[in-house]
């Protein structure tokens, strides 16, 4: 007894096709690119049917159904819009991501296409969402000139200025992306085994400001080649954030300084620094403070720490910045604070050395800051990242 | 967002029958994309699907509860039910009710315990 | 009728990878969905389709499947990985679930 003719459902073809089906013939049925074999709600990898005895199929018809790439991924920091029509999320519909303006990037182009394999798929192929990256080195500051001792800052004009509060000492940091802080190996080596005993607030000005933004960190890495307490060099440490801060106009990452930024770090070239540490009057600063510095010459600098501190020595891994006057200088407090330099091509800024060490008494002439040299730890800072995981490093000629 | 609800009693005795209610919010039954089923575990054991259903009443069943279950749909009251007859103390589990997209079962309601006892 | 076979119970390392089986008579040959569920709570979809992952679940989450065996695989395993999971297919439009392993993350 033959089986009734199979009819192919919409959007489908049957093979092989036959005049009659008797006894064990099968047929299988086949969906045009962009749909996909659906038995009720159940999705099919194949189907063929039996003609059985009684002269009926083994199985009923199946439907080829439009691939469906389901609801895209949200975004964090970014948003996603239908293109081709509201929820439409079948073969060939278009979305666009894209990211929150000003405080976040994009790589990509943010167009996604629904694809026969039911994926959201990139023009460049990528099956992952894209990912809002955080903007880094936008500021309101401006190269101030002349000015003796620092000078209080304004809102946006250090948004990665982060303060680190133990219960008895006060450093500094700077944030490079939305989970982790850059900071001198000696302001938290005491914190390295407790981690969360370290208090982290940003978004301020003044120190005792009720109005910050907490972070708490989930792990210390202090570079492997600091010894504590035995000089300075390799005095760089990464804070990671158990979570990612919200980017906006007070909270920012600073750059990384790319390879080619060592030309805008040569002697008498200004850089930035800015922290709560002690200020001319031996006192706490309450409001960020920040003073512009040249850099000095490396071979001078040396010479007065050879005189000064005999046995401490300034290495290649360190730069040094002040007046040979005196009077503009980091101190106390500001430990783990950013140097940062404008990047004249991007307009973006740029850490270029940690707060690290100097002279009992801060701005006395003749005697220099002396700040890790940021631009030789590229390698480790991104190597900490890449492996303990949280986005990637922030050079601003990315962006 | 779509969200599942499953009411109903507690407890019921043998030989009675087991009806549960699930109540759909945040989005329509009546959806071509969907059908909606339910699941159980009993204590301390794996999941168990019971059945599907699609808003036009079409079903379908585990072929080892089939001849003890119907599942019915309201699309009037965003709501679809299960009926489960002749429980014993083996129907004692925790039942959930879930929308069946393209065979991925996807969100879950919090689910409902439910005893068989005397 | 159809059986999916998983082990009971396995353990990993934080930061490790976690391979989850489940095994069935030409489960290749049809889709494999895994569910994960955390003691009191639903159960939650981690993978469909072999190897698609819902909006919302992290990409250490990943599934494969070919011949006898679909695949969980969890890389860099973290605490919060710690659950039961379990595997489900469709053969002949019932839905059918695998026991269930209990991945328990040490430490």
């Known amino acids: 007894r033959p089986c009734p003719d199979p009819t192919a459902p919409p959007n489908g073809s049957i093979s092989p096709v036959q005049a009659i089906y008797v006894l064990k013939d099968r047929f299988s049925v086949f969906c045009k690119t962009g749909f996909e074999l659906l038995q009720g709600s159940v999705p099919l990898k194949s189907f063929t049917a039996v003609c059985q005895k009684d002269g009926s199929w083994d199985r009923p018809m199946p439907e080829c159904s439009i691939i469906d790439c389901g609801p895209p991924d949200d975004l964090p920091n970014g948003h996603v819009d239908y293109i081709t029509g509201p929820e439409v999320t079948t073969y060939k519909a278009v979305i666009q991501y894209s990211c929150e303006e000003t405080f976040y990037t994009m790589s990509s182009n943010g167009k996604y296409v629904c694809e026969a394999d039911g994926f959201w798929t990139s023009s460049k192929g990528e099956k992952l969402p894209p990912v809002c990256e955080p903007v880094c080195g936008l500021s309101t500051h401006t190269i101030g000139g002349q000015i003796v001792g620092g000078q209080p800052a304004k809102p946006g004009d250090f948004p990665w200025q982060v303060l680190l509060l133990g219960q008895t000492t006060a450093a500094a940091g700077a944030l490079i992306h939305d989970n982790w802080v850059l900071t001198a190996a000696h302001a938290v080596y005491e914190k390295r085994m407790a981690a969360s005993s370290l208090n982290i607030r940003m978004g301020i000005l003044k120190r005792l400001s009720p109005h910050y933004t907490q972070a708490w960190p989930e792990e210390i890495f202090i570079h492997e080649g600091y010894t504590h307490g035995a000089g300075f060099d390799n005095d760089i440490a990464l804070i990671k954030l158990k979570n990612k801060v919200t980017i906006n106009g007070s909270i920012m990452p600073v750059c990384l300084p790319r390879k080619e930024a060592a030309s805008l770090m040569r002697t008498d070239f200004t850089g930035t620094v800015a922290g709560w540490g002690l200020t001319q009057k031996g006192l706490l600063a309450r409001n960020l403070m920040f003073v512009d510095i040249p850099i000095a010459d490396h071979q001078k600098c040396t010479a007065v720490y050879e005189k000064l501190y005999p046995g401490v020595r300034v290495s290649a891994n360190m730069l040094c910045a002040g007046l040979e006057t005196g009077g503009k200088d980091a101190c106390r407090g500001d430990s783990g604070g950013a140097l940062v330099f404008l990047d004249n091509e991007t307009q973006r800024w740029f850490v270029g050395g940690i707060v690290s060490w100097g002279s009992i008494n801060c701005g006395a002439a003749d005697q220099y800051g002396v700040y890790t040299k940021v631009i030789n730890y590229i390698p480790w800072i991104e190597n900490i990242i890449s492996n303990f995981g949280g986005g990637g490093s922030h050079h601003h000629h990315h962006h | 967002q779509v969200q599942l609800q499953e009411s109903g009693p507690g407890l019921v005795k043998p030989s009675e029958t087991l009806s549960l209610t699930c109540t759909v919010s945040g989005g329509s039954i009546s959806s071509s994309s969907y059908y909606w089923g339910w699941i159980r575990q009993p204590p301390g054991k794996g999941l168990e699907w019971i059945g599907s259903i699609y808003y036009s009443g079409s079903t379908y069943y585990n072929p080892s509860l089939k001849s003890r279950v119907t599942i019915s749909v309201d699309t009037s009251k965003n709501q679809f039910s299960l009926k489960l007859s002749s429980v014993t103390a083996a129907d004692t589990a925790v039942y959930y009710c879930?929308?069946?997209?393209?065979?991925?079962?996807?969100?879950w309601g919090q689910g409902t315990m439910v005893t068989v006892s005397s | 009728s159809y059986e999916l076979m998983q082990p009971p119970s396995m353990s990993v390392s934080p930061g490790q990878t976690a391979s989850i089986t489940c095994s069935g008579d030409?489960?290749?040959?049809?889709?494999a969905y895994w569910y994960q569920q955390k003691p009191g709570q639903s159960p939650v979809l981690v993978i469909y389709?072999?190897?698609k992952r819902p909006s919302g679940i992290p990409e250490r989450f990943s599934g494969s499947n070919s011949g006898n065996t679909a695949t969980l695989t969890i890389s860099g395993t973290q605490a919060m990985d710690e659950a039961d999971y379990y595997c489900?297919?469709?053969?002949?439009?019932?839905?059918?679930f695998g026991g269930g392993t209990k991945l328990t993350v040490l430490g």
């Open positions: 489900q297919a469709w053969e002949s439009s019932t839905g059918v």
């Open positions: 030409k489960l290749g040959d049809i889709y």
């Open positions: 879930a929308r069946d997209r393209r065979g991925r079962f996807d969100p």
């Open positions: 389709q072999d190897n």
